[in-house]
């Protein structure tokens, strides 16, 4: 798999051979693997991860469900890069509020809050 | 501070006490934070905190500047608390996949995928 | 490497509303240590800061330009644009945007407008 | 709001030393960048921090900042350094950059 192709592209062909390859992967009636239970996804990517290599390690591997299993590596690396750069650039305490103050706008409107 | 107070509650008086002692706290001219660099917040709740310790450190304390630091302390301890519940719950394949599925349904149409 | 480039009219009537986009390239104006900023430089005279704005919208204006100027973002398109109304002659300036990180780093050629009718 | 002074002017002979003021309140206390640029281009930064060089600028090129006036200082002054120089700052009681008026270096000879 080129790793040049656009992460977009990639999250959306993941979705579509994660549909085709469903019923072969939950052919394993006995395997539990850890759920988050709350929808704020960015905050559990650790555990989904660890989850993905659980069940790839319990699945037949060949053809395109290999392929299905590269592609979540990929995710992984992409989202890998993304947590490195949530410290890379040292700003003024101004740029720091105004990601913070956007932080939290977002935590306001759109995390799902269980109090 | 009431711990009782609903997380959303708290994050919105917490947005108006920023904006409040926003003066103040930019008055530190040399001071350098590390700011993420893409709009994913919920990866980055590690750095963004880390940086809130930073900036607290440096800040004279009192008055309701102090109530700003403990409410966003009180919104670390939820997102801990957030963190924590990704991998509570042990499920069958299934519920993974469902879970898995809409995790990459949302990073395909609400995350800011940089290629 | 980011790039910067000003578009918009080099020919603007007095009284009327001065418009200029900045776009971006190589980089993403949601950077979240970035500023995108507008500054201008009369003929012959020193550089005399505009404005800046922060992705999620937040914006900063020069006190003595601030009841004119409007500085917005457009994220799907990777641009910043800046509106001055009501100008007259001693508006006639090269206007540049650039990136503000903790100094201007970025740059964009900067482009010339004159007010004249 | 804040301000900073700049001399409108420095002229200097190749080979010597250039010293360029910025004068302001304080500013001793606050960071101060600088900025060179030469005719028809976008200013260039060249110290940053009071004192710190950016790759590619060279080591002629240093500053210091105490008391109320920081300085750029330029040694070994080539023609190729013939530009207008501008300070700049962050005025943190209200978020605003301030810039110097700008200094024209001329190279004599």
């Known amino acids: 798999i080129p790793t040049e192709i656009p992460t977009s592209a990639l999250v959306k062909e993941t979705l579509a051979l994660l549909s085709t390859h469903r019923t072969l992967l939950i052919a394993n009636e006995t395997l539990r693997i850890p759920v988050p239970v709350h929808k704020n996804h960015q905050l559990c990517t650790e555990e989904i991860f660890q989850g993905i290599g659980t069940l790839e390690s319990q699945t037949v591997q060949g053809g395109t469900v290999e392929r299905l299993f590269k592609n979540l590596s990929l995710i992984k690396k992409y989202i890998d890069g993304q947590k490195k750069k949530c410290g890379e650039e040292r700003r003024r305490v101004n740029q720091f509020l105004d990601y913070l103050q956007e932080f939290l706008g977002v935590m306001n409107t759109e995390w799902i809050i269980e109090s | 501070i009431p711990t009782e107070i609903p997380t959303s509650a708290l994050v919105k008086e917490t947005l108006a006490l920023l904006s409040t002692h926003r003066t103040l706290l930019i008055a530190n001219e040399t001071l350098r934070i590390p700011v993420p660099v893409h709009k994913n917040h919920q990866l980055c709740t590690e750095e963004i905190f880390q940086g809130i310790g930073t900036l607290e450190s440096q800040t004279v304390q009192g008055g309701t500047v102090e109530r700003l630091f403990k409410n966003l302390s009180l919104i670390k301890k939820y997102i801990d608390g957030q963190k924590k519940k990704c991998g509570e719950e042990r499920r069958r394949v299934n519920q993974f996949l469902d879970y898995l599925q809409e995790f990459l349904g949302v990073m395909n149409t609400e995350w800011i995928i940089e290629s | 490497q980011v790039q910067l480039q000003e578009s918009g009219p080099g020919l603007v009537k007095p009284s009327q509303t001065l418009s200029l986009t900045c776009t971006v390239s190589g980089g993403s104006i949601s950077n979240g240590g970035q500023y995108w900023s507008w500054i201008r430089q009369h003929p012959g005279k020193g550089l005399e800061w505009i404005g800046y704005i922060y992705y999620s919208g937040s914006t900063y204006y020069n006190p003595s330009l601030k009841s004119r100027v409007t500085i917005s973002v457009d994220t799907s398109k990777n641009q910043f644009s800046l509106k001055l109304s009501s100008v007259t002659a001693a508006d006639t300036a090269v206007y540049y945007c650039?990136?503000?990180?903790?100094?201007?780093?970025?740059w964009g050629q900067g482009t010339l407008v004159t007010v004249s009718s | 709001s804040y301000v900073l002074t700049q001399p409108p002017s420095v002229s200097v002979a190749p080979g010597q030393t250039a010293r360029i003021t910025c004068g302001g309140n304080?500013?001793?206390?606050?960071?101060v960048y600088w900025y060179q640029q030469k005719p028809g281009q976008a200013p260039v930064l060249v110290v940053h921090d009071d004192s710190d060089r950016p790759s590619g600028i060279p080591e002629r090129f240093s500053g210091s900042n105490s008391g109320n006036t920081a300085t750029l200082t330029i040694s070994r002054v080539e023609v190729g350094d013939e530009a207008d120089y501008s300070c700049q700052v962050w005025d943190s009681s209200s978020d605003h950059v301030v810039f110097g008026g700008g200094t024209k270096l001329t190279v004599l000879g």
């Open positions: 650039a990136s503000l990180g903790n100094w201007f780093d970025y």
């Open positions: 304080n500013i001793g206390s606050k960071n």
